[in-house]
């Protein structure tokens, strides 16, 4: 059943969607598999805090501990990755803060992507000292499990030495790894003893074994790659926005709604209004009016600007954002003060000046 009555028909018209919204990305907390993660809910004056993951209620279990404003995840796994939210319920309102958890290893196995120190791994031996292959930098091989978000680049390294200089080849799940086994193939940098796969996809999951050998012996090392799929999600609105604002009669004010959405968002600014002297319809639902929405003939829909305000403009303003997956909304109040008789220009107080450009 609808939660409000619209004053006018707001069937959404065709829109022009030229922009991709990647605004106000939620804070990201990164943990390696097996590590523990602790996050504090960054909301003030929280009487009761509830937690969700990917829109589903999160309760305590043997690995998840909820103590006051803290969320603890023990022995994190890639499945703990996702969009988390804490909601602070107060006596008069509630507020939600979103953050991402990414349980993943770094891009490369133990060093930076640019391989600046790679030349050190290429060890030259005295030609008289024949030697079977050996690892030259085991620290770069310690992390065997690599949980990587889809579309990222993965690099596995097996720095080795030996005399004569060993050769390196790679296996996937125990079989020869061929270029045609994945779209885009892969790169092998022999000088850096590395395998590089760009834009990984779920089918890249598996065990990758480097085999390093010369005529005196052979050694191998196996990495496990897990590709964490991302999936589309409903819009996220930056906590605390729009912010409450106040101004004098005749002043100007702006409300800002910061949106993060993978899919194209439809933004609406809605206000509670009166119709025939009543704030509520016959069904008991409040009357709402759409003041602005994204699409044709609409400038930056994330900002609602009110000019030369009157006392009638006071009230609650709702930023409502929808994509094809779901919805999110947050609201703010506008207080309109009587115009002071003092000489000189009134100073208007705008919402969230930090976010205005």
């Amino acid at each position: 059943r609808p939660s409000f009555s619209l004053v006018e028909d707001t069937t959404l018209e065709p829109e022009e969607p030229p922009t991709k919204y990647q605004i106000s990305q939620p804070e990201v907390y990164v943990a390696a598999p097996g590590e523990s993660l602790e996050v504090r809910c960054l909301l003030k004056d929280a009487a009761v805090i509830s937690w969700t993951k990917d829109g589903v209620h999160l309760g305590p279990n043997n690995r998840t501990v909820l103590i006051g404003e803290y969320l603890q995840i023990k022995g994190a796994t890639p499945r703990d990755s996702g969009l988390y939210a804490c909601t602070a319920s107060r006596t008069v309102d509630s507020e939600t803060w979103y953050f991402m958890v990414n349980v993943t290893d770094a891009i490369s196995s133990g060093d930076d992507e640019d391989d600046t120190d790679g030349a050190e791994d290429f060890v030259s031996e005295n030609s008289n000292n024949k030697r079977a292959p050996y690892w030259t930098n085991t620290e770069k091989m310690e992390k065997r499990l690599h949980a990587v978000p889809a579309a990222n680049t993965v690099k596995f390294r097996c720095p080795a030495g030996g005399n004569p200089m060993p050769t390196m080849r790679w296996l996937k799940n125990g079989k020869e790894f061929k270029q045609e086994h994945r779209i885009g193939g892969y790169k092998v940098r022999n000088q850096h003893w590395s395998l590089i796969m760009e834009s990984v996809v779920p089918s890249d999951k598996g065990n990758y074994t480097c085999v390093v050998e010369n005529e005196y012996g052979s050694i191998n090392h196996t990495y496990h790659l897990d590709v964490v799929e991302r999936s589309p999600h409903r819009p996220i609105l930056q906590a605390g926005l729009p912010a409450n604002a106040s101004t004098v009669v005749g002043g100007d004010v702006e409300f800002v709604c910061k949106v993060y959405s993978d899919a194209q968002p439809h933004i609406q600014w809605i206000k509670h209004v009166e119709k025939n002297g009543s704030k509520y319809g016959p069904d008991g639902l409040p009357y709402l009016k759409v003041l602005k929405h994204s699409g044709i003939n609409s400038s930056n829909a994330e900002v609602l600007a009110l000019f030369n305000v009157t006392e009638a403009d006071a009230g609650e303003y709702i930023c409502k954002v929808s994509n094809y997956i779901g919805q999110a909304n947050q609201s703010a109040w506008l207080t309109v003060l009587p115009k002071q008789q003092a000489p000189g220009r009134e100073k208007e107080i705008t919402a969230s000046p930090d976010y205005l450009e």
Partner: antibody, heavy 113, light 106 residues
Framework: EVQLHQSGTVLARPGASVKMSCKTS????????MHWIKQRPGQGLEWIGA????????NYNQKFKGKAKLTAVTSASTAYMDLSSLTNEDSAVYYC??????WGQGTTLTVSS | QIVLTQSPAIMSASPGEKVTMTCSAS?????MSWYQQKPGSSPRLLIY???NLASGVPVRFSGSGSGTSYSLTISRMEAEDAATYYC?????????FGGGTKLEIK
């Protein structure tokens, strides 16, 4: 496991009305739009509209306004679509889908006198 | 409304062959989705947000494009890929689908 289960095949007379259902399980029903799609025999796909169960918001394709009525019962995690004043043009398979990656198996509607 | 035009309407390919089909939009879009449908079955999501592979979809499928021009590529055709493919936009109301490309096996 996410599942969307739609009601079975319907045979109706011209001028009549029908109601089909889409029962969901395995995900938070209220958090996602439920879209309805029409596919005429041997034809392509048409978006009818969508309902957001959490608050009852509905968006219709203008073409189907007055023809389709979408509702949802959150306690049963089920979405419904009513089709009225049926004609032969309404004979089709109707799908419910959420997020684009969860689909029902389809309800076949045949309108015939 | 945004009209999506798919081409070709019908095509055939031999096993192992590379297949590319296109979808042209009447207005610029942010993203495109692609579906596969076989007779008697529901559509199956292959690609979302233009280039993201949906869960469980073989890596031989890929999507690309921007603005008004998008494409779906199958790197190596397999017999099980014979189906009708639809592009769809979730950017602008009313959401619309292309007319479909029917892919047959030679």
């Amino acid at each position: 496991e996410v599942q969307l289960h739609q009601s079975g095949t319907v045979l109706a007379r011209p001028g009549a009305s029908v109601k089909m259902s889409c029962k969901t399980s395995g995900y938070t029903f209220t958090n996602y739009w439920m879209h309805w799609i029409k596919q005429r025999p041997g034809q392509g796909l048409e978006w009818i509209g969508a309902i957001y169960p959490e608050n009852g918001d509905i968006n219709y394709n203008q073409k189907f306004k007055g023809k389709a009525k979408l509702t949802a019962v959150t306690s049963a995690s089920t979405a419904y679509m009513d089709l009225s004043s049926l004609t032969n043009e309404d004979s089709a398979v109707y799908y419910c889908t959420s997020r684009g990656d969860y689909w029902g198996q389809g309800t076949t509607l045949t309108v015939s006198s | 409304q945004i009209v999506l035009t798919q081409s070709p309407a019908i095509m055939s390919a031999s096993p192992g062959e590379k297949v590319t089909m296109t979808c042209s939009a009447s207005s610029g879009l942010s993203y495109m989705s692609w579906y596969q449908q076989k007779p008697g079955s529901s559509p199956r999501l292959l690609i979302y947000d233009t280039s993201n592979l949906a869960s469980g979809v073989p890596v031989r499928f890929s999507g690309s494009g921007s603005g008004t021009s998008y494409s779906l590529t199958i790197s190596r055709m397999e017999a099980e890929d014979a189906a009708t493919y639809y592009c769809q936009q979730w950017s602008s109301y009313p959401y619309t689908f292309g007319g479909g490309t029917k892919l047959e096996i030679k």
